[in-house]
């Protein structure tokens, strides 16, 4: 029950996180005009990853896309890439985790397969969250650097922009959304990985009872389950006829490195 709750909660938290990462990536307020200690203007500038906007009087807003790839700073391109990678990994992770949910039955899917998928989606969420956090942090660092350099525009050189009024930019709402969303995705991923442990069938403590017959030595192993993440063999309850040769179940009696997160 606790495993199902952990997995379900991990999925929901990751879902919220990925929705947040998508929202942050699409938002225009990555950097906003710094109003503190600046001449007060009747227009308000703010910029996103894809376009820059100017809000004039009476809420009249005009946005212009960055219709160039080569003219944009490498850092901005890197941030875009990190956010997109984060979204893609997160989306795949969500897809995988839906099928991995314990509360959803799909055919005769084994618990071991579900554990494997849960771990995979968990790792994907962790990487997705890290990508988002990294992307937002790189952008924030770029802002801080430019702020102290007092550049007139963050994307100087883009479209032959002239440095005129000292418009300084500070952290926009998208950065905070991105950080929180990345953190949630990361937490959700960790929860999925924790849930994976509980989902995986564990090795029982029963000793194998041997019955000696005249011709053959037949060992009956009542609970031969072991934790599997898909990297090992797909084991089931098996009757083991031990005629000198040992089955796969007996070969690996110690937990593998994939059994625990």
């Amino acid at each position: 029950m606790a495993v199902t709750a952990c997995q379900g909660l991990g999925f929901v938290v990751s879902l919220i996180g990925i929705a947040g990462i998508i929202a942050a990536t699409c938002m225009d307020q990555w950097s906003t005009q710094d109003l503190y200690n600046n001449p007060v203007t009747a227009v308000f500038n703010y910029q996103g990853l894809w376009r820059s906007c100017v809000r004039e009087s009476s809420g009249f807003t005009e946005c212009r896309g960055y219709f160039t790839l080569l003219g944009l700073p490498a850092m901005l391109q890197a941030v875009r890439a990190l956010m997109i990678v984060g979204i893609v990994l997160g989306a795949i992770g969500l897809l995988v985790s839906i099928f991995a949910l314990k509360c959803i039955r799909i055919g005769s899917m084994e618990d071991s397969a579900k554990a494997n998928m849960t771990l995979t989606s968990g790792i994907m969420f962790i990487v997705s969250g890290l990508c988002a956090i990294a992307g937002v942090s790189v952008f924030a660092n770029m802002l801080v650097t430019n702020f102290w350099m007092s550049t007139a525009n963050m994307y100087t050189g883009m479209g032959g922009m002239v440095q005129t009024v000292q418009t300084r930019y500070t952290f926009g709402a998208a950065l905070f959304v991105g950080w929180v969303a990345g953190g949630l995705t990361l937490i959700g991923g960790v929860m999925m990985c924790i849930a994976c442990r509980g989902l995986a069938p564990e090795e029982t403590n029963y000793k194998a009872v041997s019955y000696h017959a005249s011709g053959h030595s037949v060992a009956y192993k009542p609970g031969g389950f072991k934790a599997s993440t898909g990297f090992g063999s797909n084991t089931k309850n098996k009757k083991i006829y031990d005629g000198g040769a040992r089955t796969e179940d007996e070969v690996q009696s110690y937990p593998s490195k994939h059994d625990y997160v």
Partner: antibody, heavy 119, light 113 residues
């Protein structure tokens, strides 16, 4: 069509108070940034005050010479903007225009109301 | 505070003549965010409120005849009337619509010979 009509002007003694009103129609008043601009032979056209819309928290701005004496306010339910003027001086004399600031331009102006500060 | 200086203070012209008036701002009115100049031109006839002519330094307001042209960038701006008509006789004001206070220029009076 857009209309702005000022009222409340008149003769007032120095140090006195006066409240100007501007009734607007023909546009979504609650979205607009509203301004007061005055004109006198001595100073020409002079921007006095601005009040922004609800989305901009009804933020206000004033010219330095009236800061602390004049207060701009609005009532979106009545589509009206007001200018409360206290501690009036002779140099406040002039025609007061109510204007709408849209897209960084004063696109509509009222006919104006005259304020005379004299003893 | 930003100061808008207009020159000349008055212009005496004949009908059909081309006229140019200048407006200089003490600080650049060019916004780096959209590369737009926040300077506006108004026309005021006696006994009337000012009327919007040109905004964003060069964009003509709808209904304004195309003989009125605004140009310039940064701190130096110009209003040109290509062929002056009798109805164009008025005072022309430029205004900074970027920095507070949103100051107006001193005005240029257009008179007929």
């Amino acid at each position: 069509q857009v209309q702005l009509k000022e009222s409340g002007g008149g003769l007032v003694q120095p140090g006195g108070s006066m409240k100007l009103s501007c009734a607007a129609s023909g546009f979504t008043f609650s979205d607009a940034w509203m301004n007061w601009v005055r004109q006198s032979p001595e100073k020409g056209l002079e921007w006095v005050a601005e009040i922004r819309n609800k989305a901009d928290y009804h933020a206000t701005h004033y010219v330095e010479s009236v800061t602390g004496r004049f207060t701009i306010s609005r009532d979106d339910s009545k589509s009206s903007v007001y200018l409360q003027m206290n501690r009036l001086r002779a140099e406040d004399t002039g025609i007061y225009y109510c204007t709408r600031n849209y897209g960084s331009r004063f696109d509509y102006w009222g006919q104006g109301t005259t304020l005379t500060v004299s003893s | 505070d930003i100061v808008e200086t207009q020159s000349p203070s008055s212009l005496t012209v004949t009908a059909g003549e081309k006229v140019t008036m200048s407006c200089k701002s003490s600080q650049s009115l060019l916004n780096s965010g959209n590369q737009r100049n926040y300077l506006t031109w108004y026309q005021q006839k006696p006994g009337h409120p000012p009327k919007l002519l040109i905004y964003w330094a060069s964009t003509r307001e709808s209904g304004v005849p195309d003989r009125f042209t605004g140009s310039g960038s940064g701190t130096d701006f110009t209003l040109t009337v290509t062929s002056v008509q009798a109805e164009d006789l008025a005072v022309y004001y430029c205004q900074n619509d970027y920095f507070y206070p949103l100051a107006f220029g001193t005005g240029t009076k257009l008179e007929l010979k």
